[in-house]
Interface confidence: low
Amino acid sequence: SAPGEDEECGRVRDFVAKLANNTHQHVFDDLRGSVSLSWVGDSTGVILVLTTFHVPLVIMTFGQSKLYRSEDYGKNFKDITDLINNTFIRTEFGMAIGPENSGKVVLTAEVSGGSRGGRIFRSSDFAKNFVQTDLPFHPLTQMMYSPQNSDYLLALSTENGLWVSKNFGGKWEEIHKAVCLAKWGSDNTIFFTTYANGSCKADLGALELWRTSDLGKSFKTIGVKIYSFGLGGRFLFASVMADKDTTRRIHVSTDQGDTWSMAQLPSVGQEQFYSILAANDDMVFMHVDEPGDTGFGTIFTSDDRGIVYSKSLDRHLYTTTGGETDFTNVTSLRGVYITSVLSEDNSIQTMITFDQGGRWTHLRKPENSECDATAKNKNECSLHIHASYSISQKLNVPMAPLSEPNAVGIVIAHGSVGDAISVMVPDVYISDDGGYSWTKMLEGPHYYTILDSGGIIVAIEHSSRPINVIKFSTDEGQCWQTYTFTRDPIYFTGLASEPGARSMNISIWGFTESFLTSQWVSYTIDFKDILERNCEEKDYTIWLAHSTDPEDYEDGCILGYKEQFLRLRKSSVCQNGRDYVVTKQPSICLCSLEDFLCDFGYYRPENDSKCVEQPELKGHDLEFCLYGREEHLTTNGYRKIPGDKCQGGVNPVREVKDLKKKCTSNFLSPEKQNSKSN
């Protein structure tokens, strides 16, 4: 039988009445155009909703927008458009919400053609009040908050000026002209690229990378011949044009650009690209595009300095620069990532790694599913996950995979079961162990969200017809109850719940359509009465993450340690609560070959723990560039995985010698870098 239809599925008692008492409808008094929703702060219950309606006239577009505020998680909304003087807000800039619980909001207004500059509305009290500020420039980008100080803002102007405010947008100062891209680093540092000649596009590959650590009082040029730059974890990356041709290489710095090393990665040509897929303070996943319009490339994983890279996954699907990749960090279990590869026969297959890119495998076939037509052997196949690429191809996939750090082990995704991703209508699958095993959770495509740290999963069927039914599960997707939240079906447009999956409120957004008009409407359902009591100690059970063989004393060891979690029992219907903290008990493991990546010049054959020399490098000296000096590497093929905490056990030899040769690839070496002050 279909999931949720077994006899064992107990019904949640009196849930219809409980939910009916906690279902709040709000009809928005405006025409249906576009709607955007932002949460202000964490656990504040404050939501801002901006509705925008465009009327295309012959000469220009007339627009109107309305701003609504809720302070009870969306149960009630108040029209606060008058707080922003009924001004039309530019939706392309969205609502710039301040970091953490600063309560800061910036809205960018549409201004008439002849004005000297733009206009913003600022709030620092969770949108209770707004201050109108006229800008001395027209913004090109949304205001960007410094992660360290929400009073510090930066923005680029339409004339490529870099503007900074130190008092939350009250006063602005242009600190540099001819700026292409600017980003906040750590400690209120700003990194930006500048052009010297014509424009950002014309100077691509000849840009300069600058840094200011004092909000524009003084500057340091930290790189030349720059194509682009990026920040990931504690790494600063720059792609730099080579001297002699049109290729470029990645350089990396871990000291804010004072010193650079050439990343041991392939160089790329004009039509190729690099992409930082994921980065943390330990390491980085880097995608390097293959030459030609192949739609794939190679994933490399870095060492702890971001310099030496190991090949992690071949034929990684990534369509074009800024295009689509399915690379997904499974945040509910450390070390787990899912992505897609383009196989030789042009089909797409899903791969998963449980050890941060050390080894990739197919996803295990769900027990309650049959192999589809893509499978050559009807008894042997895998689960394949739909993510960004499928969505971009307009397949019937309404949502990307979902996982939450505080809903340990839970991953929800659309998928198909076969030898490759299928264009057939997908079903929804769930894993409760971080991707090791999967179960079909719902037939057909759905929207889904996680509430109460995994205590409740909510889903709505993806349909072109109006809907009025929501499904929910209190046992991690095994059994489902359906609740009719309105008599009059609505055209569904989205599910909204507070980021972080701690809330017990879900908002269903949509619009009603009648003969003459259509209106936005939201239904907010509070599940607090479904989970009547707070969870107690007896409601939790011990779970060993990454466990594949309970007989093995090293079972669960990933990246050098194992973790036991306290997890809610599926049968317990209770509230984890907003203050729920994931309880885990780590223990260190002995080192094995699994704790080491293959070093520069080595690779791991499929289904083998040993690293062997790459044939093309056999007998060659292994050299790479470190802080502008050439290094000689003596290795037996292994290096510790960044973030691996193992101790004792296997200890392969690895030694690096300074060859005292320069190798900066035309990049500015520290002694050539210049500084200047304003």
């Epitope: 319009d293 192949t294 739609g295 794939f296 699907l317 369509t319 897609s340 383009l342 026969d345 042009n346 089909s347 797409i348 049959e370 589809d372 037509a373 893509t374 690429y389 499928s390 191809q393 307009k394 397949l395 019937n396 490759a420 991703i421 299928s422 264009v423 057939m424 209508v425 037939e443 057909g444 495509p445 349909s463 072109s464």
Partner: antibody
Framework: QVQLVQSGAEVKKPGASVKVSCKAS????????MSWVRQAPGQGLEWMGI????????SYARKFQGRVTMTRDTSTSTVYMELSSLRSEDTAVYYC??????????????????????WGQGTTVTVSS | EIVMTQSPATLSVSPGERATLSCRAS??????LAWYQQKPGQAPRLLIY???TRATGIPARFSGSGSGTEFTLTISSLQSEDFAVYYC?????????FGGGTKVEIK
């Protein structure tokens, strides 16, 4: 085993409509698209369109747009093809065929194709005054 | 739409001989091509998909090759039951289109 069983032969007058059914069994009906293909006497195969059994959305070859409607009934695992404003040149054998299209990457919307792997026995439609 | 052209229209071959059928697409269809066999009074039968993969239950004497615009179906040693009409079909871009067919007859 997997089977597609079509409705019986039809004789229609010009200007009339015909509705051909195709009942699927032996597999999950909603897991595969269904194509309709026709073959005029002594001629080759001509693809008419494809229907997604889950949502019921269909895509038609331009030649038939406005005249053809493909629908499905999930409760009976049946798809239907209705062709209206019949003319003599619509005399043909009409086939339904399971069409498990696959997806691939390189290039826009390119797909890995698995072929129409199961066909109905065909329904003869004769249009004659 | 993509036009599929098959050649020859008729191929006369003796049993046990090799038969080579061609299919050309008016633009690249990558490897999104299938081959079908049809005997008189019967529905078509899938032989090859993905340009080169044999469908379930299809004998090894049938093989497909090619990619892009040029495709070939080869029957290595013709059996009596192989005399039929063969169609190629692309599924790179909608609408799906068939070739005009190649009739393989006994010489």
């Amino acid at each position: 085993q997997v089977q597609l069983v079509q409705s019986g032969a039809e004789v229609k007058k010009p200007g009339a409509s015909v509705k051909v059914s195709c009942k699927a069994s032996g597999y999950t009906f909603t897991s595969r698209y269904m194509s309709w293909v026709r073959q005029a006497p002594g001629q080759g195969l001509e693809w008419m369109g494809i229907i997604n059994p889950v949502g019921g959305s269909a895509s038609y070859a331009r030649k038939f747009q406005g005249r053809v409607t493909m629908t499905r009934d999930t409760s009976t695992s049946t798809v239907y093809m209705e062709l209206s404003s019949l003319r003599s040149e619509d005399t043909a054998v009409y086939y339904c065929a399971r069409d498990p299209s696959g997806i691939a990457a390189a290039g826009p919307a390119s797909r890995y194709y698995y072929g129409m792997d199961v066909w109905g026995q065909g329904t003869t439609v004769t249009v004659s005054s | 739409e993509i036009v599929m052209t098959q050649s020859p229209a008729t191929l006369s071959v003796s049993p046990g001989e090799r038969a080579t059928l061609s299919c050309r697409a008016s633009q690249s269809v990558s490897s999104n091509l299938a081959w079908y066999q049809q005997k008189p009074g019967q529905a078509p039968r899938l032989l090859i998909y993905g340009a080169s993969t044999r469908a379930t239950g299809i004998p090894a004497r049938f093989s497909g090759s090619g990619s892009g615009t040029e495709f070939t179906l080869t029957i290595s040693s013709l059996q009596s039951e192989d005399f039929a009409v063969y169609y190629c079909q692309q599924a790179r871009l909608g609408p799906w289109t068939f070739g005009g067919g190649t009739k393989v007859e006994i010489k």
